[in-house]
Amino acid sequence: EFEQAPEFLLGDGSFGSVYRAAYEGEEVAVKIFNKHTSLRLLRQELVVLCHLHHPSLISLLAAGIRPRMLVMELASKGSLDRLLQQDKASLTRTLQHRIALHVADGLRYLHSAMIIYRDLKPHNVLLFTLYPNAAIIAKIADYGIAQYCCRMGIKTSEGTPGFRAPEVARGNVIYNQQADVYSFGLLLYDILTTGGRIVEGLKFPNEFDELEIQGKLPDPVKEYGCAPWPMVEKLIKQCLKENPQERPTSAQVFDILNSAELVCLTRRILLPKNVIVECMVATHHNSRNASIWLGCGHTDRGQLSFLDLNTEGYTSEEVADSRILCLALVHLPVEKESWIVSGTQSGTLLVINTEDGKKRHTLEKMTDSVTCLYCNSFSKQSKQKNFLLVGTADGKLAIFEDKTVKLKGAAPLKILNIGNVSTPLMCLSESTNSTERNVMWGGCGTKIFSFSNDFTIQKLIETRTSQLFSYAAFSDSNIITVVVDTALYIAKQNSPVVEVWDKKTEKLCGLIDCVHFLREVTVKENKESKHKMSYSGRVKTLCLQKNTALWIGTGGGHILLLDLSTRRLIRVIYNFCNSVRVMMTAQLGSLKNVMLVLGYNRKNTEGTQKQKEIQSCLTVWDINLPHEVQNLEKHIEVRKELAEKMRRTSVE
């Protein structure tokens, strides 16, 4: 049943009109071709629609000759260009990603059937739902000019100005499927910028084709003010390469998009070369600016740098006579001020006001290098005091009342001797487990210790054990980091193993062998030798994402995510950088909850002496990465099953 009435009209085109109608009790779209439309065009579209069955392609339900028409499934949410123009607010990052993923899936399917689509644009992408984890969100429609392609390619100029590849627009040049990849790059650009380019194109239609043909598309983030999306921006650049051969194939585009890392990596900032960052701290989440303080430097000087994440503005100042090894932010809510405390290799504790950098002084000097700092938060609700805890290379724990950091030369309230020169106090950590809010843990030499707000040592666990056998050599190494929830996770110097200790029984209850997990990934990709892997699997940093995942950063630049509830691997982010240095969770203004990961990249410099130039790189990750890995895997699995079902049905 259908009526060619204006209220049922869904759209017009040069071929004819599309109406909303009913077919076998279902709402459908009926494409009525103009009387003068050649039968060849209808046949061409029919051939394509009849032979292709895929979750990303609009399905043909029926066809008629008098009048010439096609009955197709109806997309309840309309076209992507309508969404870009009228409902931008619905376009969350995950939805943007899923739309792109579904279109790429359809495109690679068409290309595998040797078909060039030739008219990929937001108008031809139809939406079925805006729920980001639905199996079917977006489909490609309108096969009017899709064409089978021989190996050599085709020559006719088709497509829509402003949405086509330069080789198509020029005309009279042979082109192939890579032209669609260019159009996909433009589509991705339009999704990222929520259609900003299209609005301008409507104002200046003559120039619409010119900009992208000449590769002069403005920077999406700077020009349209959209939030950075590093891996998508990179993919857009690759798809918009002038030379079709330099563009990825549609299958490669799909593989790139089929990645939770692509969705969740929200920022990638390269710091100036040879700024070697040792530590970082994020400003308090109540502050206006999403900003980070970085402790850097070489043996004879310490630099404190400030990075504004909104503007990516970077300032740096030499503040100490030796390397800054650790940083802490002390927030004093009553005074409405915050202070950055820098611990240096020479034992100096330098305190700088975050609002007024001229307000600065030092606290009483420590007896050895300051190896860790922690400002605890025992008294979020209660009237208890808060403290700045200072660990030193000679195994001492100095306790300052937080308020005293304002005072020049302030002395600690108490100093505990936990270790000695050969057993440095390398780390301090608060438990994420809500049942022990007032318990702090630390690592000193090979011992783990705990204490509460009265600063008496409650537990002292010796972690030296021959149980590791395969990794026995690392058991005697000093602990470099401890993170705590229901269990204790500890990493030791140069060890590729994270030891898991039971707090109650004080026994080792498991080992997380990074080499094994890395090997599982690399065996498939045949990447590294065993010895190399043991070296690149050295654990450098740990970070606990409450009730979700343990993030492990390695010396070889890999990040491992481990599910806390099952102790199973969620994901290895392989070769993320040359070496991961620091990982921490933060609440940063509008960025909400994020994971900050700082790593080093080493580049060989030009010239005769092959010196390695180090560049620090800060990345900001959406904290939902572990969930997104699982969601995306499920999503892809469901779509695979759907595609297989459709393929089987078409064969039958």
């Epitope: 149980q467 056998f469 395969s470 039971d502 026994k507 080792l508 209850c509 498991g510 080992l511 997380i512 062998d513 990074c514 080499v515 094994h516 997990f517 090997r519 599982e520 481990l562 099952t566 102790r567 199973r568 691997l569």
Partner: nanobody
Framework: QVQLVESGGGLVQAGGSLRLSCAAS????????MGWFRQAPGKEREFVAA????????YYADSVKGRFTISRDNAKNTVYLQMNSLKPEDTAVYYC??????????????????WGKGTQVTVSS
């Protein structure tokens, strides 16, 4: 369904030896860690040794290191525990266990996915 069947237990004099076997079936075990645990009367179950099915990395409790050796035969889908220089305190029910957690090696029973029914080892003085 994964099945683990232990054998080789028995009565032995202090200083003697025993070899326990654990036959595994119902799965491809390449990604598994296989372990031996023991439970003495009135005591908690404790870790003895573990081995990676692929790669063969081994792990031992301090109390058995140097006396016990864990090994596996991939062709037979079997894991062995060679126990030498046995002591009366080694008396316990020995359980074979399997865990499919890749690079996570459980040294506490709570993280093992499958268990055998156990075999009794008694060391007399």
């Amino acid at each position: 369904q994964v099945q683990l069947v232990e054998s080789g237990g028995g009565l032995v004099q202090a200083g003697g030896s025993l070899r326990l076997s654990c036959a595994a079936s119902g799965r491809t075990f390449s990604s598994y860690t296989m372990g031996w645990f023991r439970q003495a009367p009135g005591k908690e179950r404790e870790f003895v040794a573990a081995i990676r099915w692929s790669g063969g990395s081994t792990y031992y409790a301090d109390s058995v290191k140097g006396r016990f050796t864990i090994s596996r035969d991939n062709a037979k889908n079997t894991v062995y525990l060679q126990m030498n220089s046995l002591k009366p305190e080694d008396t316990a029910v020995y359980y074979c266990a399997a865990s499919d957690r890749g690079g996570f090696i459980a040294t506490s029973g709570g993280w093992m996915d499958y268990w055998g029914k156990g075999t009794q080892v008694t060391v007399s003085s």
